[in-house]
Amino acid sequence: MRRGPRSLRGRDAPAPTPCVPAECFDLLVRHCVACGLLRAPRPKPAGASSPAPRTALQPQE
């Protein structure tokens, strides 16, 4: 299962903390929300320059 993107302690926080599983970081309100609220599908790679499918070990957004 995909871990959610990292949340921020504050707007200028240098070290983001991870959202809990099934949550994603909402860039516009700057906190973690349910991933399903964000229209956040897995990306479809289009070529060599596109990222590989995500794994739990990859850094999140």
């Epitope: 921020l8 909402d26 860039l27 309100v29 964000l38 956040a40 320059s49």
Partner: antibody
């Protein structure tokens, strides 16, 4: 596939209100951010604002208090109202959906040209 | 707001040539989460804008590999290795790091020389 379609009058008189509808199919507007963007003659793109999954809104300060974005979740539509228009508001108006993983506009309506003229 | 400065405004090219478009932001586009949310769109005549490149260098689904994006911080470039007729239109860079509002470059019109 997600599809967006703008509708509304193509001609609005100065000082009147511009009203547009964006009809969304293939996705629910109770998920994600739904946006209005306009393109002026000469290619300048201006971000106007959004309505979010929760119904909260953001309006570009450049539009001051002239703008309102609302939604009807039962119809899966969201709306733009721009008050007191002038000829400077003549533009092609687009509604667009926002990808919430990489934060780009992944789906756009075809756009509707609105001319402000008496 | 972040100002996105695109150059050139017009780019006449011959088919098969390489084209290069520059985009500069008024502040660094590196988000505090480490990501750089700089994207490129192409608007063909009579169409709405379509995503080409996301997060500086990632081609969107279906985008030919002749398109490539590069850059960091405040300076970014879109390159088309061999221009084809279907590439003509207006290219926009856009940032989603310091939002809202989302902001766009002024556009570069790619046209036949």
């Amino acid at each position: 596939d997600v599809q967006l379609q703008e509708s509304g009058p193509s001609l609005v008189k100065p000082s009147q209100t511009l009203s547009l509808t964006c009809s969304v199919t293939g996705d629910s507007i109770t998920s994600g951010y739904w946006n209005w963007i306009r393109k002026f003659p000469g290619n300048k793109l201006e971000y106007m604002g959004y309505i979010s999954y929760s119904g909260s809104t953001y309006y570009n300060p450049s539009l001051k208090s002239r703008i309102s974005i609302t939604r009807d979740t039962s119809k899966n539509q969201f709306y733009l109202q721009l008050l007191s228009v002038t000829t400077e508001d003549t533009a092609t108006y687009y509604c667009a959906g926002l990808d919430g993983l990489y934060w780009y506009f992944d789906v756009w309506g075809a756009g509707t040209l609105v001319t402000v003229s008496s | 707001d972040i100002v996105m400065t695109q150059t050139p405004l017009s780019l006449p090219v011959s088919l098969g040539d390489q084209a290069s478009i520059s985009c500069r932001s008024s502040q660094s586009l590196v988000h505090s989460n480490g990501n750089t949310y700089l994207h490129w769109y192409l608007q063909k005549p009579g169409q709405s804008p379509k995503l080409l490149i996301y997060k500086v260098s990632n081609r969107f689904s279906g985008v030919p590999d002749r398109f490539s994006g590069s850059g960091s911080g405040t300076d970014f470039t879109l390159k088309i290795s061999r221009v084809e007729a279907e590439d003509l239109g207006v290219y926009f860079c856009s940032q989603s790091t310091h939002v809202p509002p989302f902001t766009f470059g002024s556009g570069t019109k790619l046209e036949i020389k």
